[in-house]
């Protein structure tokens, strides 16, 4: 009888001990195949659960736009007085909604390459307004060509267009003129086959962004998604020295298993620059667990602040000696035209660059730049891209219309959100495909370890209490 | 086809009056400007004069400030030089020529102008 | 006013020689220079502007280069109808400028 107590007793023991070793081997075990899995996940080729997001995201992506309308155009032209704006927004567009083209395979050196179709729908229920809006702006082409054309014989011949089309340094455009194009009547007289079309994202809707190549993961996961190449070329030619780097991903995915310390780099097409995000916050995304990325105040530094944007100066005069900071020059990818950008309402520039202007309140919750990615698969599950389009604006002597100015302005025209969250859907899948299955698995692991490790400890407690009675 | 054919050259006293024509064909005059550039015998070629587009600003050489004038008749497609108190100097081949940007794409074939008593 | 200087005023080639010609500029034109070619009683004929930019129509053995106050105008293999005298022009300001010419003569 004692001796079928005590064996009973040392099976539970050993059955214990069985359940908490099986318990700590499946700990790494798990993590293993969780890994494998993921890795085997988030390789960009065909029937994996990352090529099917990344072909078409399912995220709906919304741009917004506030348009700075000026309120003092005549006193400025004539005085070089202060430019007072006033923000007009959100006006909102569906984008991001076409798949991605052309996607093509190349086995031998584990790429893909692809085109992003342009595309922009107007949302009138999340607008304040239409896209009929007319806004008091900048005038584009004024403003550009004594920039681009700095001879001044041309200047001149300049001139004599903008006054004869009634031109001046400011012009009332509608929203849909302004975003998308508007033929300008001063370009419109240019004797020669130019383009006469102007608008901030002419031309934009019927084209694409790319060629991307990015590698596809499938020989070294570490690598996914970070791009190989970009318009056939490995740098930019934008910016001198490494500034010109393509660097990191698109920022819609990154390889997996981010930590914290990580800095995520990645490229933009839209400020024509490779860029970084630094870990901000752990927060709950619909149940998910996500890293918050932020850009920081640092990647918009002047090279005094910090040397490694010193490429990024590459021109001495508006930018103080490169003092100034919190725009970024992007002229020579834009076909030489005056377009500098920054974040919005001026947000981490240095005072003299705002201090033109009246009527912008920065605020960092608002206009900042955000990524949160879920760190085991790599996946941006949320962002929010804010920039601001801005526009040089120069006296010229030559050009009636800007003769009167005593000093540049960089001219806010409008600044953007694009955002895009993770469809409640799209998340409660994601929940259950991947966080839901490893914390099922940390669960079990949990459960195993500790019911084997009370089982073993009561058991053999019971052992030893009984053995020591049954010796009495 | 542009085309640019000068004429009213001639010879001419000094201190005396000549006015050069430039008929143009093929482009319109104001969308361009015109200038009127001139070549003594075995020198050579100096810029004299300009009229920007759209009947704008109207430009000399200082060697004629005062004495030359340029203008446009944009019905009939054609510029003029008028030239007052020539000077034996101001004897050349003068050349009406289009351009936009600065330099110029098309010539006429000269009209010679000789300033002599 | 920006004075171009030319050289040489005139240099004897021959037919299948490569001919340089420079003009320079006394202050910073940028790439705003263009090239003539002006045969005897003929009007001058644009071959180059921008300083590199071959005007439709010219023949390829022409090109152009410089930027900022130092120009040329190369010849890579002298034609019979190459020889004439060839112009540079700024037209960077007003009052805009020739050089003094180059007269390209038979050897």
């Known amino acids: 009888m004692g001796c079928d107590r005590n064996c009973g007793l040392i099976a539970g023991a050993v059955i214990g001990a069985v359940l908490a070793v099986f318990g700590g081997i499946l700990m790494p075990v798990g993590d293993m195949l969780i890994e494998k899995t993921i890795k085997r996940e988030v390789v960009l080729e065909e029937g994996t659960t990352a090529f099917k997001n990344w072909v078409k995201t399912g995220t709906t992506v919304y741009r917004q736009f506030w348009i700075f309308d000026v309120q003092n155009p005549d006193d400025v032209a004539k005085n070089s007085s202060k430019i007072k704006v006033k923000q007009r927004g959100p006006y909102t567009y569906r984008v991001r909604y076409l798949a991605k083209e052309n996607i093509t395979q190349d086995p031998e050196d584990h790429t893909v390459s692809f085109v992003q179709p342009n595309g922009a729908i107007f949302e009138p229920s999340l607008s304040v307004g239409t896209e009929d809006d007319n806004f008091t702006v900048l005038n584009l082409a004024v403003a550009a060509a004594p920039h681009i054309y700095q001879n001044s014989f041309v200047q001149v011949v300049l001139n004599s267009l903008i006054k004869k089309s009634k031109s001046s340094m400011f012009q009332t455009r509608s929203l849909k003129e302004l975003l998308w194009g508007y033929k300008d009547p001063f370009l419109s007289l240019v004797p020669y086959p130019i383009s006469t079309t102007v608008g901030v994202f002419y031309p934009y809707n019927d084209t694409v962004d790319g060629v991307y190549k990015v590698f596809n993961g499938k020989d070294n996961i570490s690598k996914v998604a970070i791009i190989e190449s970009y318009k056939g070329k490995r740098n930019l030619s934008y910016w001198p020295s490494y500034c010109d780097m393509i660097n990191g991903t698109d920022a819609a995915s990154f390889p997996p298993f981010v930590e914290k310390s990580r800095t995520l780099r990645f490229f933009s097409s839209d400020i024509c620059r490779s860029i970084y995000a630094v870990f901000g916050s752990e927060i709950d995304l619909k149940g998910i667990p996500v890293y918050r990325f932020v850009l920081p105040a640092n990647a918009f530094a002047s090279p005094l602040q910090n040397p490694d944007n010193h490429c990024f100066c590459t021109e001495k005069v508006i930018s103080n000696n490169c003092t100034s900071y919190g725009v970024l020059d992007i002229g020579k990818c834009k076909e030489g035209k005056p377009v500098y950008i920054s974040l919005p309402h001026f947000l981490h520039a240095s005072p003299d660059v705002s201090e033109p202007i009246e009527g912008l309140h920065p605020n960092e919750d608002e206009h900042r730049t955000y990524l949160d990615v879920e760190p085991i698969t790599g996946f941006t599950l949320q962002f929010a891209k804010r920039l601001q389009v801005n526009i040089l604006v120069k006296p010229a002597r030559k050009i009636e219309a800007l003769k009167n100015l005593k000093r540049p302005y960089i001219v806010p025209i409008l600044w953007l959100n694009e955002t895009g969250t993770i469809g409640d859907e799209k998340a409660e899948m994601f929940k259950t495909q991947v966080t839901g299955k490893i914390k099922l698995l940390g669960m079990v692991e949990m459960a195993l370890l500790g019911i084997g490790v009370v089982m073993f400890v009561a058991f053999m407690i019971s052992y030893c209490a009984c053995k020591s009675k049954n010796g009495k | 086809e542009v085309q640019l054919v000068e004429s009213g050259g001639g010879l001419v006293q000094p201190g005396g009056s000549l006015r050069l024509s430039c008929a143009a064909s093929?482009?319109?005059?104001?969308?361009?400007?015109i200038h009127w550039v001139r070549q003594a015998p075995g020198k050579g070629l100096e810029w004299v004069a300009w009229?920007?587009?759209?009947?704008?600003?109207?430009y000399y050489a200082d060697s004629v400030k005062g004495r030359f004038t340029i203008s446009a008749d944009t019905s009939k497609n054609t510029a003029y030089l008028q030239m007052n108190s020539l000077r034996a100097e101001d004897t050349a081949v003068y050349y009406c020529?289009?351009?936009?940007?600065?330099?110029?794409?098309?010539w006429g074939q000269g009209t010679l102008v000789t300033v002599s008593s | 006013d920006i004075q171009m200087t030319q050289s040489p005023s005139s240099l004897s080639a021959s037919v299948g020689d490569r001919v340089t010609i420079t003009c320079r500029a006394s202050?910073?034109?940028?790439?705003?220079v263009a090239w003539y070619q002006q045969k005897p009683g003929k009007a001058p004929k644009l071959l180059i502007s921008?300083?590199?930019s071959l005007y439709s129509g010219v023949p390829s053995r022409f090109s152009g280069s410089g930027s900022g106050t130092d120009f040329t105008l190369t010849i890579s293999s002298l034609q019979p109808e190459d020889f004439a005298t060839y112009y540079c022009?700024?037209?960077?300001?007003?009052?805009?400028?020739f050089g003094q010419g180059t007269k390209v003569e038979i050897k």
């Open positions: 020529a289009r351009s936009f940007f600065g330099y110029f794409d098309y």
């Open positions: 093929g482009f319109t005059i104001s969308s361009f400007g």
């Open positions: 009229i920007a587009p759209y009947g704008g600003d109207t």
């Open positions: 202050q910073d034109v940028s790439n705003w």
């Open positions: 921008y300083a590199t």
């Open positions: 022009q700024q037209h960077s300001n007003a009052p805009l400028t």
